[in-house]
């Protein structure tokens, strides 16, 4: 079966919907096709375009009950079940390499229906807060995707650096100094699509002292003692997508 040739025979696009979908790494994701009954279909095709890889195609032809794959090497990306029973695609589990564009093409006798997903894999950064010099604190959000945002309460004299890693994650480092001596406690607030986290630390007056915030260095999902952290679940933690029709 040459699914490309057949798709071209029915190249009229009757409807196309594209959605951006942020999804947490290590969760399971299910991507859905348009709501069209199998009885109306000739071919179902999933096109998967991942960065730096040839386009992968998974196709099912109803007439022959035949499935075919082209350039598909990732065994974590599969049909949810037999395509004649469920045309959805699943990624179990989502890895950082699954960033890309996924499109379901449903070929009917009258034209095609497309449902596309721009999948953005989210990686929760590891957050640490410590004091490295007199009245200077360093807050780091390590290996997050996308880059986390760091803010301080109260505001200080701050410098922020970003370090980009080859796997697409970013480490954000914010170093702040407070000249005002009545500031004794500072809070680092890390905002990220996977959730938000706040750490605070008491500034030591002793020169050269190094002090870590309690619980610093743990992941965003951890619960910390003494309520030094506030955890707010972000919008990116859902396994399934709410569809827009």
């Amino acid at each position: 079966m040459d699914e490309k040739q057949i798709t071209q025979n029915y190249s009229k696009v009757l409807a196309e919907v594209n959605t951006s979908w942020p999804v947490k790494m290590a969760t399971n994701a299910v991507l859905c096709c348009p709501p069209i009954a199998l009885r109306n279909l000739i071919i179902i095709t999933w096109e998967i375009i991942l960065r730096g890889q040839p386009s992968c195609t998974k196709a099912y032809r109803k007439e022959t009950n035949e499935t075919k794959e082209t350039n598909c090497t990732d065994e974590r990306i599969t049909w949810v079940s037999r395509p004649d029973q469920n045309s959805d695609l699943q990624i179990r589990p989502v890895a950082i390499t699954h960033d890309g564009y996924y499109r379901c093409i449903m070929v009917t006798p009258d034209g095609n229906f497309h449902r596309g997903y721009h999948l953005q894999v989210l990686v929760t950064p590891e957050v640490t807060l410590f004091q490295n010099r007199n009245r200077t604190a360093v807050c780091k959000a390590v290996a997050g995707k996308p880059a986390a945002q760091i803010s301080w309460i109260p505001e200080g004299d701050c410098a922020t650096k970003q370090e980009y890693w080859s796997n697409g994650t970013v480490t954000v480092k914010s170093t702040c100094h407070w000249e005002v001596h009545n500031v004794s406690t500072v809070t680092c607030h890390v905002s990220h699509l996977t959730g938000n986290k706040s750490l605070y630390i008491e500034l030591l007056p002793v020169p050269g002292a190094k002090k870590s915030a309690k619980g610093g260095g743990s992941g965003l999902n951890d619960i910390f003692e003494a309520q030094k952290i506030e955890w707010h679940e972000g919008s990116g933690g859902h396994h399934h997508h709410h569809h827009h029709h």
Partner: antibody, heavy 119, light 110 residues
Framework: EVQLVQSGAEVKKPGASVKVSCKAS????????MFWVRQAPGQRLEWIGY????????KYNEKFKGRATLTSDKSASTAYMELSSLRSEDTAVYYC????????????WGQGTLVTVSS | DIQLTQSPSSLSASVGDRVTITCRAS??????????MHWYQQKPGKPPKLLIY???NLESGVPSRFSGSGSGTDFTLTISSLQPEDFATYYC????????FGGGTKVEIK
């Protein structure tokens, strides 16, 4: 404009057969599945079956299997529903309805054909 | 087979009233991110007319006073302000694999 025009009313005796036609226009007949639905007086709508003129696939409600036969004439863009061994409880209005792809919904219906079964 | 139970079976209302009709399925009609529930209006001697598809989508040309909601097994059709032409019978319908209709709700003039 999509139109589904059904044949006229029929009066039949118990045990007889009836064949209702549904002529489609305004679209490519073979591209869409045609459903048949009936409505007895004061009753809910009831699915009889469907035919896909693209490949002649048919599916029937278990209740009508063996009594209902769905066919189509592609050259005439017409779907047919034949019901045999008629009984009085088959007295109903019979509708054809085109299934639209997205959501499997029925936007276009025939006007209905009243079939009366009476001795 | 999925059974659809509509309530109430009939109701009396006045022009301008807000009307709510419910439909309960014997098992979930939601799959793959979509709810396969549609709503139709039928007047005597006429075929049904599609109002709402996939639970909440307004069919083209249908007045915005009609709305649908729900997922899983429980669905609702709402008419925000009943108009004289809205007195009719309303049916919910599921059509994923097998086609099923609810028993209907007749909306009458009070």
């Amino acid at each position: 404009e999509v139109q589904l025009v059904q044949s006229g009313a029929e009066v039949k005796k118990p045990g007889a057969s009836v064949k209702v036609s549904c002529k489609a226009s305004g679209y490519t007949f073979t591209s869409y599945v045609m459903f048949w639905v009936r409505q007895a007086p004061g009753q809910r709508l009831e699915w009889i079956g469907y035919i896909n003129p693209y490949n002649d696939d048919t599916k029937y409600n278990e209740k009508f299997k063996g009594r209902a036969t769905l066919t189509s004439d592609k050259s005439a863009s017409t779907a047919y529903m034949e019901l045999s061994s008629l009984r009085s409880e088959d007295t109903a209005v019979y509708y054809c309805a085109r299934e639209d792809y997205y959501g499997s919904r029925f936007v276009y219906w025939g006007q209905g054909t009243l079939v009366t079964v009476s001795s | 087979d999925i059974q659809l139970t509509q309530s109430p079976s009939s109701l009396s209302a006045s022009v301008g009233d807000r009307v709510t009709i419910t439909c309960r399925a014997s098992k979930s009609v939601s799959t793959s991110g979509y709810s396969y529930m549609h709503w139709y209006q039928q007047k005597p001697g006429k075929p049904p007319k599609l109002l709402i598809y996939l639970a909440s989508n307004l069919e083209s040309g249908v007045p915005s006073r009609f709305s649908g909601s729900g997922s899983g097994t429980d669905f609702t059709l709402t008419i925000s302000s009943l108009q004289p032409e809205d007195f009719a019978t309303y049916y919910c319908q599921h059509n994923r694999e097998l086609l099923t209709f609810g028993g209907g709700t007749k909306v009458e003039i009070k």
